[in-house]
Interface confidence: low
């Protein structure tokens, strides 16, 4: 268990006084004294404080700058910050989502293992034997080579990680 402290929860120690902290959404105007309570004021428009605090200034809500590819995912309140996310086709460059970059495309020979989200980039994987991707795409997975046998055809040209196999008719003379 935590050792006891001089003041109780939601209090802070100043000049030998246990003063009440200001509640989320409010900032400190003046410390308590023996004769007066802590004085707090609500945060202004576009400001917030998300904890019990003794801050003398509220924090500004985050600005979701469209020039950086950002848009508002959740509007801030006096107790919460604005949450930004990226425009469609873009993803955040950091956990704080301070700017966005275009989703990466997977080159030919690579397919999408995981489609990008607003916070994570596309994850690509090399197409294994039996699969190919002939396009640069942020959505396309590796496709399996065509099965010539199921079409009663034969492989005329082997597939690669970038190209499908080429099927052709069976050579009947060999039967």
């Amino acid at each position: 268990p935590e050792p006891p402290t001089a003041c109780r929860e939601k209090q802070y120690l100043i000049n030998s006084q246990c003063c009440s902290l200001c509640q989320p959404g409010q900032k400190l105007v003046s410390d308590c004294t023996e004769f007066t309570e802590t004085e707090c004021l609500p945060c202004g428009e576009s400001e917030f404080l998300d904890t019990w605090n003794r801050e003398t200034h509220c924090h500004q809500h985050k600005y979701c700058d469209p020039n950086l590819g950002l848009r508002v995912q959740q509007k801030g309140t006096s107790e919460t910050d604005t949450i930004c996310t990226c425009e469609e086709g873009w993803h955040c460059t950091s956990e704080a989502c301070e700017s966005c970059v275009l989703h990466r495309s997977c080159s030919p020979g690579f397919g999408v293992k995981q489609i990008a989200t607003g916070v994570s980039d596309t994850i690509c994987e090399p197409c294994p034997v039996g699969f190919f991707s002939n396009v640069s795409s942020a959505f396309e997975k590796c496709h399996p080579w065509t099965s010539c046998e199921t079409k009663d055809l034969v492989v005329q040209q082997a597939g690669t990680n970038k190209t499908d196999v080429v099927c052709g008719p069976q050579d009947r003379l060999r039967a």
């Epitope: 402290t5 001089a6 023996e34």
Partner: antibody, heavy 114, light 106 residues
Framework: QVQLVQSGAEVKKPGSSVKVSCKAS????????MHWVRQAPGQGLEWIGY????????KYNQKFKDKATITADESTNTAYMELSSLRSEDTAVYYC???????WGQGTLVTVSS | EIVLTQSPATLSLSPGERATLSCSAS?????MHWYQQKPGQAPRLLIY???KLASGIPARFSGSGSGTDFTLTISSLEPEDFAVYYC?????????FGQGTKLEIK
């Protein structure tokens, strides 16, 4: 109104112990620390320590760490200070005072004499 | 430990005069508090947080100062003001008192 009423004067032998009480009324006992202050005859004031009655947290002046033990009983709104291994130099008036020091007990004279 | 030094040790003045008591701290403190003590009585809080008048204290008492130098002023002495005055700091543990200034009738 706020009142701090201390126990009566004590005469003690050197080497013995004494426990001084301070009964609080007129406010919520657990909301404020209780301090103890010493004043030797003809001398100034010395802070001994305090207790937070809400969780029994204590803080002592290092000078009194081995001399004084401060406790509190929430059920009776009473703070206590026990002084051990008494010597003639411990002869003094001992005061309790509520956090912020606006309210003081009347003082308890502890005389240590053989 | 912060040492508080009060001056003068004794101040002899007449009723109606102005009294200025000083308290110097060995290092900077946030606030200073002042008490009055009469013989056989507990100390009485006069001024807290350097300049705020405690409940029931007459307006002739005032406090000022910052950092290491603080002053208690009694604008016009009344007969009941003759007593010992202590400064007190609660900014740094251990909390300390000055040695006192005795204000006596001249």
């Amino acid at each position: 109104q706020v009142q701090l009423v201390q126990s009566g004067a004590e005469v003690k032998k050197p080497g013995s112990s004494v426990k001084v009480s301070c009964k609080a009324s007129g406010y919520t006992f657990t909301n404020y620390w209780m301090h103890w202050v010493r004043q030797a005859p003809g001398q100034g004031l010395e802070w001994i320590g305090y207790i937070n009655p809400s969780n029994d947290y204590t803080k002592y002046n290092q000078k009194f760490k081995d001399k004084a033990t401060i406790t509190a009983d929430e059920s009776t709104n009473t703070a206590y200070m026990e002084l051990s291994s008494l010597r003639s130099e411990d002869t003094a008036v001992y005061y309790c005072a509520r956090q912020g020091f606006p309210y003081w007990g009347q003082g308890t004279l502890v005389t240590v004499s053989s | 430990e912060i040492v508080l030094t009060q001056s003068p040790a004794t101040l002899s003045l007449s009723p109606g005069e102005r009294a200025t008591l000083s308290c110097s701290a060995s290092s900077s403190v946030s606030y200073m508090h002042w008490y009055q003590q009469k013989p056989g009585q507990a100390p009485r809080l006069l001024i807290y947080d350097t300049s705020k008048l405690a409940s029931g204290i007459p307006a002739r008492f005032s406090g000022s100062g910052s950092g290491t130098d603080f002053t208690l002023t009694i604008s016009s002495l009344e007969p009941e003001d003759f007593a010992v005055y202590y400064c007190h700091q609660l900014s740094s543990d251990p909390f300390t008192f000055g040695q006192g200034t005795k204000l006596e009738i001249k």
